[in-house]
Amino acid sequence: PLATIPVSTTSLTSSEGSTISTPSVDISTPVTTSIVGDQCSRCKNGGFWDGLKCQCLTPYYGESCEEVVNSIDIAPPETVSAQMELTVTVTSVKFTDELKNHSSQEFREFNKTFTEQMNIVYSGIPEYVGVNITNLRLGSVVVEHDVLLRTKYTPEYKTALDNATEVVKQKITKVTTEQIMTNDNCSALMCFNTTGTQVQNITVTQYDPVEECRQKAEEYEDYFLVEYRDQKPYCISPCESGFNASKNCNHGKCQMSQNGARCLCVTTETHWYSGEDCNQGTQKSHHHHHH
């Protein structure tokens, strides 16, 4: 996706008084514009000139789209869902042709009663949303339907939905075993044929923040990783501060390259710094002036 890159600078001042300017970047606003004039070569990494500035592609920013952002916005869905395709056989209702027609009064009445029954069955499942009848057929009434489950996105959403689908299976098995006809009559809202209960298929929302992060990081995919904060995933490079994976460059600036994160060490009026993490300071001799 294309992104508008408004670049403001944040000044970092070292204890010795030198400054490094690092851009603060917003990569969230999509744009569509066209290349103007012969400024294309000014914008690197697939970015293009819009007449005023370079429009950079994720994960790049800067005047010429030459720098790599420290974090990429990934947005997991607010909620995730599962759909279970089930079949149950209702014995307390005799199949009639009107039930084939989803707009008939008979179908609407059956749908209402069946929904009420299933709402009772699944009442203890917080993820339960409802049921949707997909087909009714002879035998007495074979009800093909979907059970819909939904939960808030968390890193453990798959486990939560998997657990909920197991409880659905347990509850539908229990009710279709207990609510059965006696002497050709049913005392419950609906009665069932115990052997007619089947789970055909289960579909769970697929969302992988790691995969989204890697895709958006493109050729830097090996260096961006996902960390969680308050159950929200963040796609970060080691140059993003405040995370477990953050690189500490001490007296330097973290910069992404195609070989990963590296520290660019600063030189002050009194010291120059070296080492992989810019933590080795060497004091300059007093008679030497640094320009």
Epitope: T91, S92, V93, K94, T96, E98, Q105, E106, E109, F110, K112, T113, E116, M181, D184, N185, C186, S187, A188, L189, M190, C191
Partner: nanobody, 123 residues
Framework: DVQLVESGGGLVQPGGSLRLSCAAS????????MAWFRQAPGKEREGVAF???????SYAESVKGRFTISRDNALSSLYLQMNSLRAEDTAMYYC?????????????????WGQGTQVTVSS
């Protein structure tokens, strides 16, 4: 809109008879299930007698052999002939209907209801 109106209730001596009627308007009388339920003071509503579109009938154990349910599709009416009435038959009697061919005695399965007619069996 379906409307069910009961009539025929009243005060009768033990051993006596009554015939309850239910006039159904807006209900396709040749389809579904029609039923009589009753509710005595302080008790749950219970199913008394049921009749399906094909004439299949069923009765609560307590009324078998004494009560007879029937329906006249031409007149869109439901009837309950009650013989050998007992004090324990005293209750408000309700006509109920469903468009579905039901085999359940559970009141919650019936979406259409009348206002009821009072039957009192007392000497």
């Amino acid at each position: 809109d379906v409307q069910l109106v009961e009539s025929g209730g009243g005060l009768v001596q033990p051993g006596g008879s009554l015939r309850l009627s239910c006039a159904a308007s807006g209900f396709p009388s040749s389809r579904g299930t029609m039923a009589w339920f009753r509710q005595a003071p302080g008790k749950e509503r219970e199913g008394v007698a049921f009749i399906n579109s094909d004439g299949r009938t069923s009765y609560a154990e307590s009324v078998k052999g004494r009560f007879t349910i029937s329906r006249d599709n031409a007149l869109s009416s439901l009837y309950l002939q009650m013989n050998s009435l007992r004090a324990e038959d005293t209750a408000m009697y309700y006509c109920a209907a469903s468009l579905l061919y039901l085999m359940t005695v559970n009141a919650a399965a019936y979406p259409y209801w009348g206002q009821g007619t009072q039957v009192t069996v007392s000497s």
